[in-house]
Interface confidence: low
Amino acid sequence: MPNSEPASLLELFNSIATQGELVRSLKAGNASKDEIDSAVKMLVSLKMSYKAAAGEDYKADCPPGNPAPTSNHGPDATEAEEDFVDPWTVQTSSAKGIDYDKLIVRFGSSKIDKELINRIERATGQRPHHFLRRGIFFSHRDMNQVLDAYENKKPFYLYTGRGPSSEAMHVGHLIPFIFTKWLQDVFNVPLVIQMTDDEKYLWKDLTLDQAYSYAVENAKDIIACGFDINKTFIFSDLDYMGMSSGFYKNVVKIQKHVTFNQVKGIFGFTDSDCIGKISFPAIQAAPSFSNSFPQIFRDRTDIQCLIPCAIDQDPYFRMTRDVAPRIGYPKPALLHSTFFPALQGAQTKMSASDPNSSIFLTDTAKQIKTKVNKHAFSGGRDTIEEHRQFGGNCDVDVSFMYLTFFLEDDDKLEQIRKDYTSGAMLTGELKKALIEVLQPLIAEHQARRKEVTDEIVKEFMTPRKLSFDFQ
């Protein structure tokens, strides 16, 4: 993405006012729920961009005091808009995708640098995962603290999650789980996986039963990633909240120490949002504290939590880290991943509701081939001649991006990068290389998923003592 500054604060301020009017008029008229939701999301996104740029909340009666000078080159000449990231919206105007270095600065996290990767290698005695080596997990909060604890034989545990919005999971959804499995293996630590079926019930047009059934179905895909049944607890919020007083007590503690104003500022909630949405962040925060799982950790409150997640989930955990010391708990540490790009390009996060935006875990070999050939955005030239002469652009080519996620062989990947950039490899050949990686990967996943019986799911989802051997 070009190194550009966001639109001036005054422009942003005016855009919010305009968008606010639009939302009000849509609500007053006969607009569809989708139209209203989309307009509200845009409003929230603008408000959060304003807060990030101004360092304070947008207030309708308080225009920015020192607006940045506006461009005098006319509207068509303005630089690309600032990326926007929150738990529900990911927007960038760049074909390369989000500018992650800028995001680190904006979110106040730390870059996963060579030094940290080397330290992980030393601590575990294992070669760092290619997600680390390739900057797919690119940002962290307090990972050095986790390594300090680990090196001093102090325990920690992993926490990640999934919002089960539909039965169909796509390959992008696997990223945090693939990495979390590696973390579990190399550090030999317990793992809790939260299925936020309650969140999906609140945000989507689902019944409670549907939300829960999605959680169970998604759990099968997660289990198929190879998690150790003796070290992993998968739980549905709808199920576990009612049976764990430790968990619910922490939810209430968090709710007591976070104000509505704070969650409005962090998540952009509006007065028309149901109260379930407003209190939900406390439920996603609670697994960060070890005594939410008395069957695993008894009542210990001092066990550090490490959360691998996509960067869009960071607002939840910024709130969690803020509230932790106020309720006497350690702050959870975080490892952030980049977004998995949609087939159509890196400008947005994929959606499970658009079947052509991604490769689904249920896709057949033929569907994979068709989708990649037909929908994967290409960084190649318009003609073979031009491509041979000028080469392709790996920075925007989705097939190459997917290979960085799924082709483990560094040498092969580097050879493909060189060949495609030089023009020696054509777009069709690059797509073929990706298809040859994805087809067996998905087929193997489907085979493993078939072996996940209801009994296995039940065991993973039963609160119980976990087995691990902290050394």
Partner: antibody, heavy 121, light 110 residues
């Protein structure tokens, strides 16, 4: 029902050896750290040794270091205590105990009924 | 000589409240959880209090535990004859890398 059943105790001469076993049932043995705790006649409890669930972390009381070896066979659901160079002061009832805390904190929620070891000439 | 210090005996009449103390140091009670065990005559010990103050299921709420700094205490209210037993406190000791017990307190119900 959780059960821990010790065996292998008996009379042994000073300098001799004994191997105690603790057969576990009613729970997933491989998920739990285990300890041996002893009690000399008319005396208090003394922790002897602990082993983590997978067997990689082992701890001993100073009084038995270098003489006793704790081990486990998760496939047989059995905990062992190999006792060498026995002394008169090792005479005690030996209990095996399940540690429910996940990082060996001594949260002994289940105990066996004990096996008596007598070291005497 | 035990690492954790308990009074050798305590007594009370039925219905009374008695407290048993357990004193340690920064490397055991000061930095780890305290556990209390009850040993009835001729039986194996039984977990009474875990994590300083938590009761396992089945333990009556007449038993309560607390911890402050490097000391802990077990309180028994509404004393009953069946509470006559030996009581032991225990904690992990970081400097010894070992689990340590108190010497035990013999509780007599008069």
């Amino acid at each position: 029902e959780v059960q821990l059943l010790e065996s292998g105790g008996g009379l042994v001469q000073p300098g001799g050896s004994l191997r105690l076993s603790c057969a576990a049932s009613g729970f997933t043995f491989s998920s739990y750290d285990m300890s041996w705790v002893r009690q000399a006649p008319g005396k208090g409890l003394e922790w002897v040794s602990a082993i983590s669930s997978g067997g990689s972390s082992i701890y001993y009381a100073d009084s038995v270091k270098g003489r006793f070896t704790i081990s486990r066979d998760n496939s047989k659901n059995t905990l062992y205590l190999q006792m060498n160079s026995l002394r008169a002061e090792d005479t005690a009832v030996y209990y095996c105990a399940r540690d429910v805390a996940w990082d060996m904190l001594g949260d002994f929620d289940y105990w066996g009924q004990g096996t008596l070891v007598t070291v005497s000439s | 000589q035990s690492v954790l210090t308990q009074p050798p005996s305590a007594s009370g009449t039925p219905g009374q409240r008695v407290t048993i103390s357990c004193t340690g140091s920064s490397s055991n009670i000061g930095s780890n959880y305290v556990y209390w065990y009850q040993q009835l005559p001729g039986t194996a010990p039984k977990l009474l209090i875990y994590a300083n103050s938590q009761r396992p299921s089945g333990v009556p709420d007449r038993f309560s535990g607390s911890k402050s700094g490097t000391s802990a205490s077990l309180a028994i209210s509404g004393l009953r004859s069946e509470d006559e037993a030996d009581y032991y406190c225990g904690a992990w000791d970081d400097s010894l890398s070992a689990y340590v017990f108190g010497g035990g307190t013999k509780l007599t119900v008069l």
